[in-house]
């Protein structure tokens, strides 16, 4: 009786979530005479095992960040250990879970911006990395400004691109920043994974010190 978990030796691909303790077999290969036993080779990492009778399983939780795909080969052997079928490729794709925090590359960033700079033009980038799969929400990062100090009249002078971490001036910042009044600012910036959309997301913060420099360009006199 062949089914989802048993059948003949043929190329196959299986997807398994990382971080899960083994709970069931992966597959039961059926031997055709004169094959009496099976042999597993490839990227087993001492995690994947095949019993002589063809039962393929794994013995501990997988980690996608160590190896995202395990390329294995299974061969059927006769009673003399001679390969009579295969080896065939067996691919184990390790599915990502959100088991890694985003981390800023620096705990502190420093930058400068000239007053009256064009709004939206980046003058500094903050950058975080997350070992989780960037093709899934687990590794999709969302940058936010948490605090701007000082905050004058409750107006944000700085903005951040939520996806790229690019910091630039807001329209108000471009118009109102004046080094004579306040030459420096501090931002606390957070980064969240899960695209910032989940209560279960992980986060990290960093500090950004910004110096405002004088715009020395003067409009020519008429």
């Amino acid at each position: 009786q062949e089914g989802k978990f048993s059948g003949p030796l043929k190329p196959m691909t299986f997807s398994i979530y990382e971080g899960q303790e083994p709970s069931q077999i992966i597959f039961q290969f059926k031997a055709n005479p004169p094959a009496v036993t099976f042999e597993l080779t490839g990227e087993t990492d001492n995690i994947f095992v095949i019993e002589r009778e063809g039962l393929l399983y794994y013995n501990r939780a997988l980690d996608r960040e160590t190896r995202s795909t395990h390329n294995l080969q299974v061969a059927a052997l006769d009673a003399n250990g001679i390969i009579v079928e295969g080896p065939v490729p067996i691919t184990i794709k390790v599915k990502d879970i959100n088991d890694n925090r985003p981390t800023f590359l620096q705990s502190k960033y420093e930058g400068s911006v000239r007053q009256n700079s064009r709004p939206g033009k980046p003058f500094l980038y903050v950058n975080a990395t997350d070992l989780d799969d960037p093709a899934t929400p687990n590794g999709q990062l969302y940058y936010q400004i948490v605090i701007q100090l000082p905050m004058i009249n409750n107006v944000m002078y700085f903005q951040i691109n939520n996806k790229t971490g690019a910091i630039s001036l807001t329209r108000e910042g471009s118009q109102e920043l004046n080094p004579a009044k306040n030459p420096s600012y501090n931002l606390v910036i957070s980064v969240k994974d899960m695209g910032g959309q989940s209560e279960n997301s992980f986060s990290d913060t960093t500090s950004v010190d910004i110096i405002v420099t004088e715009n020395i360009w003067k409009a020519p006199k008429p």
């Epitope: 004169p34 009496v36 009673a79 003399n80 250990g81 001679i82």
Partner: antibody, heavy 126, light 108 residues
């Protein structure tokens, strides 16, 4: 201790058949392969075939035999698990079949012939 | 079929002499699949070295084996009278299993 006891010497006429036996003791018969080798006087060893006596029924056992192409049609291997005995039948005998025939156990760890029978001398002569 | 070529076919060595017998394989095999057997006149072969370099039970430590790919050898570090015998190499890599033609080693 492991032993492979072969049947005695045979003197047969050309065209006849002969069945040589190899009775094993000291281990579980169905756990290992039994191989047969041919050695002519002052010549080297030739591997004939093997049988893996995994099951008592002949039909099933025959699925677990393997022959050197050179000896297909000449040699037929069988096994009787109830008596832990392997057999090799040689048919259509000619003087070229005169030789000493050995059975040997295939060791499943490193796969080599770890125990041998004492040999059976076959003489084909009219 | 894989052809096993042994050399020399016949050799004589004095007691205490170092002896090397070679086995050339027609196509590359794994070292775990190369074995040596010793046979004395009128007796059945005995396993002598298995998997290229592992001494079978009871084999004196003056024997050793080495090699890889297509070239293998059996060495006796110091020849003794009881070592006089015929030695066969054998491959367990593919069917049909094949033996070398043998090296007959005599004592001087």
């Amino acid at each position: 201790q492991v032993q492979l006891q072969q049947s005695g010497a045979e003197l047969v006429k050309p065209g006849a058949s002969v069945k040589i036996s190899c009775k094993v003791s000291g281990y579980t018969f169905t756990d290992h392969t039994i191989h047969w080798m041919k050695q002519r006087p002052e010549q080297g060893l030739e591997w004939i075939a093997y049988i893996y006596p995994r099951d008592g029924s002949t039909n099933y056992s025959e699925k677990f035999t393997g022959y050197n192409e050179k000896f297909k049609g000449k040699a037929t291997l069988t096994a009787d698990t109830s008596s832990s005995t392997a057999y090799m039948q040689l048919n259509s005998l000619t003087s070229e079949d005169s030789a000493v025939y050995f059975c040997a156990r295939g060791y499943r760890g490193f796969f080599y012939f770890d125990y041998w029978g004492q040999g059976t001398t076959l003489t084909v002569s009219s | 079929d894989i052809v096993m070529t042994q050399s020399p076919t016949l050799m004589a060595a004095s007691p205490g002499e170092r002896v090397t017998i070679t086995c050339s394989v027609s196509s590359s095999i794994r070292s775990s699949n190369l074995h040596w057997y010793q046979q004395k006149s009128g007796t059945s072969p005995k396993p002598w070295i298995y998997g290229t370099s592992n001494l079978a039970s009871g084999v004196p430590v003056r024997f050793s084996g080495s090699g890889s790919g297509t070239s293998y050898s059996l060495t006796i570090s110091s020849m003794e009278a009881e070592d006089a015998a015929t030695y066969y190499c054998q491959q367990w890599s593919s069917y049909p299993f094949t033996f070398g033609s043998g090296t007959k080693l005599e004592i001087k």
